[in-house]
Amino acid sequence: MAEDFVSENSNNKRAPYWTNTEKMEKRLHAVPAANTVKFRCPAGGNPMPTMRWLKNGKEFKQEHRIGGYKVRNQHWSLIMESVVPSDKGNYTCVVENEYGSINHTYHLDVVERSPHRPILQAGLPANASTVVGGDVEFVCKVYSDAQPHIQWIKHVEKNGSKYGPDGLPYLKVLKHSGINSSNAEVLALFNVTEADAGEYICKVSNYIGQANQSAWLTVLPKQQAPGREKEHHHHHH
């Protein structure tokens, strides 16, 4: 990929320039929802220019979209996964060094022509750990045109068994979206005990389908106060 690494003689100072305009000819991208989009602006210059991205003329920040985005500097690319209608707009790459600046704009249209099941932000909920007596929060970021039903579920044991006679796991719904539930995307656990350790599942559904992701909670023993003898606790599960 010649356009990815452009080496210049250190004495030959040069403002940024495009190295592969063929890859930039398609300015309008109409993409079905939930697909991945990749915009490229292969460039060169000396010193090697930097690249930044704007959305609709303003700085494009990770928090501007669920799931964020990836920038592959060595490939001069911007990657957005699982695009949604709110991703529509103009995306401008700005490539600059001390000798100049160039830019190129792509227009993204997200074609949303069929209802779809919920999409969950990758990496959430995230694994967490806390000490006995501590507090912890799990977050599940959901995208769905149709506001989904959100459930927080934990695997539990009954009579020392994790599975019922039917071979299915014992599950407990800890929280679900509804009239009496505030901010169902967040599960807060307070004053945790070792029994709270385990897998927590965020399960969302709308009338099209479901999605679920899980995270693990590790509960650590409380640190002993300085100067005190270490206490011994034996736990049998």
Epitope: P115, R117, D145, Q147, S205, I208, Q210
Partner: antibody
């Protein structure tokens, strides 16, 4: 192409059991709810319930809870609607639907003595 | 249960007319959680509009949907001969996913 194909028309007597089917093709069957909808002769649409084939999560309308059973066999991409004891009032066209956008052709169930 | 009340229950119109059908929910529902279907005699329902205002793929642009809260509207901007059918709204906010009773659009 994406489609749902339902089993053929049935003529049954009151008290008999019945299981009708809905086979999905052209898409990932486990990733969409299959809904069942009843339409009695000359009447409107009634939502009966739904199943998520991936984990067999099932939900019923209170009007149909205990009257019918919804199930699925994801290995053959097929959902089912069944009755253990039919009544004359079960005479209707029954549709399966993937979410909202893809519908089966319908199965006419006639219950008559 | 959330009840969906459609009006009118039937209407007569001519080709080229602008037709509006309304659906009222018995309680506030999310603006994105209503669908509109068209059904012709002996056929399965066909999705026209989903999530209140999104036109389903392949559906002519003369169909449009709008609304939020409790009131939802299906509009046919210029009625065509193939549009004579029965139209249903549906809420998908909460189980059971209830339908309206239907609006039959007949030729005047």
């Amino acid at each position: 192409q994406v489609q749902l194909v339902q089993s053929g028309a049935e003529v049954k007597k009151p008290g008999e059991s019945l299981k009708i089917s809905c086979k999905g093709s052209g898409y990932s069957f486990t990733n969409y709810y299959i809904h069942w909808v009843r339409q009695m002769p000359g009447k409107g649409l009634e939502w009966m319930g739904a199943i998520y084939p991936d984990n067999s999560d099932t939900t019923y309308s209170p009007s149909f809870q205990g009257q019918v059973t919804i199930s699925a066999d994801k290995s053959i991409s097929t959902a089912y609607l069944q009755w253990s004891s039919l009544k004359a009032s079960d005479t209707a066209m029954y549709y399966c639907a993937r979410g909202a956008d893809i519908w089966g052709q319908g199965t006419l169930v006639t219950v008559s003595s | 249960d959330i009840q969906m009340t459609q009006s009118p229950s039937s209407l007569s119109a001519s080709v080229g007319d602008r037709v509006t059908i309304t659906c009222r929910a018995s309680q506030d529902i999310d603006p994105y959680l209503s669908n509109w279907y068209q059904q012709k005699p002996g056929k399965a329902p066909k999705l026209l509009i989903y999530d209140a205002s999104n036109l389903q793929s392949g559906v002519p642009s003369r169909f449009s949907g709008s609304g939020s809260g409790t009131d939802f509207t299906l509009t046919i901007s210029s009625l065509q001969p193939e549009d004579f059918a029965t139209y249903y709204c549906q809420q998908t906010t909460s189980h059971p996913y209830t339908f309206g009773q239907g609006t039959k659009v007949e030729i005047k």
